[in-house]
Interface confidence: low
């Protein structure tokens, strides 16, 4: 199709080579067409999947995204050619930074319902550069935490290194929705609730004598509870003896609850005590079986191919540890009578 009639927007993504970060493009189709294409779906406030589910017809979404090759080749369908770019309804998510993301991206309605719709498209010219400002050591992170129940703030990474003399008006979005009341390079949250979690985008305009463009950064904001003051507790095993049948296989599960820690390095392992000897056992990897805002339950199993007389003399000890301390629970095997 002819893209000469598309409205054009220029964007700059300056990424930090020190950290992982994502980027998004919104399909800002002219109103009133937009609302007909991007049909909403209903979720509860906390069901925020990594990529929002597609709804409606068998079409993957209601808008089509293309990239325009720089050599003048025909437009390429994003979904077919770029696995690191995810289309989520009217938003394009770039999962990894890199100058190879530079280029022209075009979106338009998938269903052309009227002659007007043919010209209803947006062309976004994206320039991607690594951050070169060596003096900007303390730029805001692209992953920021807010402590539930306290005051907090979300800073725009691309502006956090600028002097106060340079304070452009910033446009903020939360999960793609314009936050119309926010204009500064920092959103101050008087009291943090769980709904403050999400993907925030900050935009501001830069100009030179020739043209102007939008500088954009994406911030993943997580709402967290304060770091736990407790060592982990073992939920299972509860009993210190376990009835077993000799010669039969046995799996003993150790489940432990770890309180939230911003820097989370949980330890859960099994070791065996036999007389004065003790040694760690090679067991399957630990797995998280439940994760909430406040804590995480991690399980690790010890597997005996068959229980022997020797195992009845041993103690099987589950050891769990976080930054606060450790807890152990030992199990003695007892032959079933």
């Amino acid at each position: 199709f002819n893209i000469s009639g598309c409205s054009t927007k220029k964007l700059l993504w300056t990424y930090s080579t020190r950290s992982e970060e994502e980027f998004v493009l919104f399909c800002d189709l002219p109103e009133p067409q937009k609302s007909h294409f991007c049909h909403r779906n209903r979720l509860s406030p906390k069901q925020v999947p990594e990529h929002l589910p597609f709804m409606g017809s068998n079409d993957l979404s209601d808008v089509q995204w293309y990239q325009q090759p720089s050599n003048g080749d025909p437009l390429e369908d994003i979904r077919k050619s770029y696995p690191h770019i995810i289309q989520d309804k009217c938003t394009l998510h770039f999962l990894t930074p890199g100058v190879n993301n530079s280029g022209s991206y075009i979106c338009r309605p998938k269903m052309i319902k009227s002659p007007y719709d043919v010209a209803c498209c947006v062309k976004m010219i994206l320039e991607v550069k690594p951050q070169t400002n060596a003096s900007c050591e303390y730029s805001a992170s692209h992953k920021q935490d807010l402590l539930l129940g306290s005051t907090g703030s979300i800073s725009c990474p691309s502006l956090s290194c600028q002097s106060d003399a340079q304070s452009p008006a910033v446009t903020w979005y939360k999960n793609g929705k314009l936050l119309s009341v926010e204009r500064s390079n920092r959103i101050v949250v008087d009291e943090v609730y769980d709904y403050h979690q999400g993907t925030y985008v900050c935009d501001y305009t830069q100009s030179d004598t020739v043209s102007s463009w939008t500088v954009r950064a994406v911030v993943q904001v997580r709402t967290i509870v304060g770091d736990t003051k407790l060592k982990p507790d073992i939920l299972d095993p509860v009993e210190d003896t376990l009835e077993v049948e000799l010669g039969k296989p046995l799996t003993i599960s150790c489940k432990a609850r770890f309180g939230f820690e911003r820097v989370f390095n949980p330890v859960i392992k099994w070791y065996i005590k036999d007389s004065d000897l003790e040694w760690e056992v090679s067991v399957p990897e630990a797995k998280s079986i439940k994760s909430t805002l406040k804590d995480e339950i991690i399980e690790r199993n010890i597997i005996l191919e068959k229980v022997t007389q020797r195992d009845l003399r041993r103690k099987f000890v589950c050891f769990v540890q976080n930054s606060i301390g450790n807890t152990t629970q030992s199990v003695q095997l007892k032959e079933k009578r």
Epitope: C38, H39, R40, P45, Q47, L52, C90, V181, Y195
Partner: antibody, heavy 123, light 107 residues
Framework: QVQLQESGPGLVKPSETLSLTCTVS????????WTWIRQPPGKGLEWIGY???????NYNPSLKSRVTISVDTSKNQFSLKLSSVTAADTAVYYC?????????????????WGQGTTVTVSS | AIQLTQSPSSLSASVGDRVTITCRAS??????LAWYQQKPGKAPKLLIY???NWESGVPSRFSGSGSGTDFTLTISSLQPEDFATYYC?????????FGQGTKVEIK
């Protein structure tokens, strides 16, 4: 199909505490925000406040000093208490579910409502 | 708090008429506006959210438009079941607030 049902005394004396409960049936109370709204006779709607399943609350500043909203997830219920009532608190009280509509954008909507319960404040 | 002012407060119309109700916000609220219909003795029913999007099951004769401070609810061809009171509500900032309502009566 989620349904909401308000319950509580229809008559409350001035200076006492109004207590209402909203029972959620046909769905879980988890993962949503739950709202109270009231409507005085012949007048418009007034948002009282909400609670999340985890107990986070947000109240209308005009009522904040007198309002408490609580949740009991085990009973699939949430409740409203309004203290020191006067005749001005006479109204139909509605409970409603607040949902987020997602497109990549977020929109808040109150999509499921109870049928309302009339509370009269009179001695 | 953000104030919402609806106009007119009431109107009389006939079946088949085109009816327009406006809602003005005291400050910009982007498109964070919903419209509800309320019939006597009943709870409000969501018609439109995000200023212009139909709630499922709502007839297409209802449409919403606007952004910022000025919003409109239009009923393209009034039906007998549309005689009711209509409220706008903002979801831009707490506390959520409603307009005072517009009563649509039979002429």
């Amino acid at each position: 199909q989620v349904q909401l049902q308000e319950s509580g005394p229809g008559l409350v004396k001035p200076s006492e505490t109004l207590s209402l409960t909203c029972t959620v049936s046909g769905g879980s109370i988890s993962n949503y925000y739950w709202t109270w709204i009231r409507q005085p006779p012949g007048k418009g709607l007034e948002w009282i406040g909400y609670i999340s399943d985890s107990g986070s609350t947000n109240y209308n500043p005009s009522l904040k000093s007198r309002v408490t909203i609580s949740v009991d997830t085990s009973k699939n219920q949430f409740s409203l208490k309004l203290s020191s009532v006067t005749a001005a608190d006479t109204a139909v009280y509605y409970c409603a579910r607040e949902t987020i509509v997602v497109r990549g954008f977020y929109f808040y909507v109150m999509d499921v409502w109870g049928q309302g319960t009339t509370v009269t404040v009179s001695s | 708090a953000i104030q919402l002012t609806q106009s007119p407060s009431s109107l009389s119309a006939s079946v088949g008429d085109r009816v327009t109700i406006t809602c003005r916000a005291s400050q910009g609220i982007s498109s964070a506006l919903a419209w509800y219909q309320q019939k006597p003795g009943k709870a409000p029913k969501l018609l439109i959210y995000d200023a212009s999007n139909w709630e499922s099951g709502v007839p297409s004769r209802f449409s919403g438009s606007g952004s910022g401070t000025d919003f409109t609810l239009t009923i393209s061809s009034l039906q007998p079941e549309d005689f009711a009171t209509y409220y706008c509500q903002q979801f831009n900032s707490y506390p959520w607030t409603f307009g005072q309502g517009t009563k649509v009566e039979i002429k």
